[in-house]
Interface confidence: low
């Protein structure tokens, strides 16, 4: 025997109180698939969240973060405060990257400067709070005509040149 509720399309629910008639989802609720016995409450983008897409009878609201914050987690489940380049977010707010580390984004953590010596190279441009060091050829490679500059590879150790 076919379930009469299977005929209820998205945007409706199978209302047991009304002989399983397909009733439209009430305001601020939705059903994204057919055959549902209840509608889900729409997500409310409150507080640090703001509405990116309004809820409809067939789809949930989507949130992003207010300016100065960025999304974290699946479906923007959390908002985290932005910091400036050269900073990272701590419990007490945005703090400058400590010496030997950098952050070139408005979120994320400070990362150690590349240690050019691990690749047998030398520091061509010193690192700052906002930028990694730039590695150049090793001193032995600096023969006439040699001018290659390689971008630094991700590394865990800080560069050894002063800021």
């Amino acid at each position: 025997l076919q379930d009469p509720c299977s005929n209820c399309p998205a945007g409706t629910f199978c209302d047991n109180n009304r002989n399983q008639i397909c009733s439209p989802c009430p305001p601020n609720s939705f059903s994204s698939a057919g055959g549902q016995r209840t509608c889900d409450i729409c997500r409310q983008c409150k507080g640090v969240f703001r509405t990116r897409k309004e809820c409809s009878s067939t789809s949930n609201a989507e949130c992003d973060c207010t300016p100065g914050f960025h999304c974290l987690g699946a479906g923007c489940s959390m908002c985290e405060q932005d910091c400036k380049q050269g900073q990272e977010l701590t419990k007490e707010g945005c703090k400058d990257c400590s010496f030997g580390t950098f952050n070139d984004e408005e979120h994320g953590v400070c990362r150690p400067w590349t240690d050019c010596s691990l690749d047998g190279k030398s520091v061509l441009v010193n690192g700052t709070k906002e930028r990694d060091v730039v590695c150049g050829p090793s001193p032995a490679d600096l023969s006439p005509g040699a001018s290659s500059v390689t971008p630094p590879a991700p590394a865990r150790e800080p560069g050894h040149s002063p800021q």
């Epitope: 409310q44 983008c45 409150k46 507080g47 640090v48 969240f49 703001r50 207010t66 300016p67 100065g68 914050f69 908002c79 405060q81 400036k84 007490e92 707010g93 945005c94």
Partner: antibody
């Protein structure tokens, strides 16, 4: 880092008044700023925010009569149609959506009386 | 707008005692809650943010907890300097709920 409110005085009902919060030691480009008031012997009452991008958010009761604006180093609160109910100490506060209001000014007293 | 209901309105405890202040939000505020201390004639001072995180420089005698709609501030080992009014504060708004303070709790230290 500090905040200092100014502009509070005795005014008659209906008189407009603008309060100024002067900030030092930090940039208004990095922080949300709020105005909060406190009537004599009463609790704290939030008036509104201005965010880092200059967007404005007001308490429902404050919309229309209170206007927040800012320059590079000041945050202003313009008040119109003042009544005796608006008699209060007005505070500016630094803060926003992550850590609450972490820095407050000493407040400036506005007295509305005929 | 959201409503923050703070209880009790006033509490009196001896030096060395413990005080708990409660704050109930009219809806879930997801731990966007701060607590402030205010002494007469002074500006408020932030004690707690994020419902339970202690602000820098605040003694560990102050602690707080809560989630959803129910929050509490506890002051243990009371000192005379703790005599003040304490406010809870929902601080994360864009639109809709509106920022709100609790009505305040006066703490008297005997």
């Amino acid at each position: 880092q500090s905040l200092e409110e100014s502009g509070g005085r005795l005014v008659t009902p209906g008189t407009p008044l603008t309060l100024t919060c002067t900030v030092s030691g930090f940039s208004l480009n990095d922080y949300w700023m709020s105005w909060v008031r406190q009537a004599p012997g009463k609790g704290l009452e939030w008036i509104g925010y201005i965010d880092v991008g200059g967007s404005l958010y007001y308490a429902s009761w404050a919309k229309g009569r209170f206007t927040i604006s800012r320059t590079s180093t000041t945050v202003d609160l313009k008040m119109t149609s003042l009544t005796t109910e608006d008699t209060a100490t007005y505070f500016c506060a630094r803060g926003g959506l992550t850590y609450g209001f972490d820095l407050w000014g000493p407040g400036t007293l506005v007295t509305v009386s005929s | 707008d959201i409503v923050m209901t703070q209880t009790p309105a006033s509490v009196s405890e001896p030096v060395g005692g413990t005080v708990t202040i409660n704050c109930q939000a009219s809806e879930d505020i997801s731990s966007y809650l701060a607590w402030y201390q205010q002494k007469p004639g002074q500006r408020p001072k932030r004690l707690i943010y994020g419902a339970s995180d202690l602000a820098s420089g605040v003694p560990s005698r102050f602690s707080a907890s809560g989630s959803g709609t129910e929050y509490a501030l506890t002051i243990s080992d009371l000192e005379s300097a703790d005599a003040a009014t304490y406010y809870c504060h929902y601080y994360a708004t864009i639109s809709g709920l509106g920022v709100a303070f609790g009505g305040g709790t006066e703490v008297v230290v005997k």
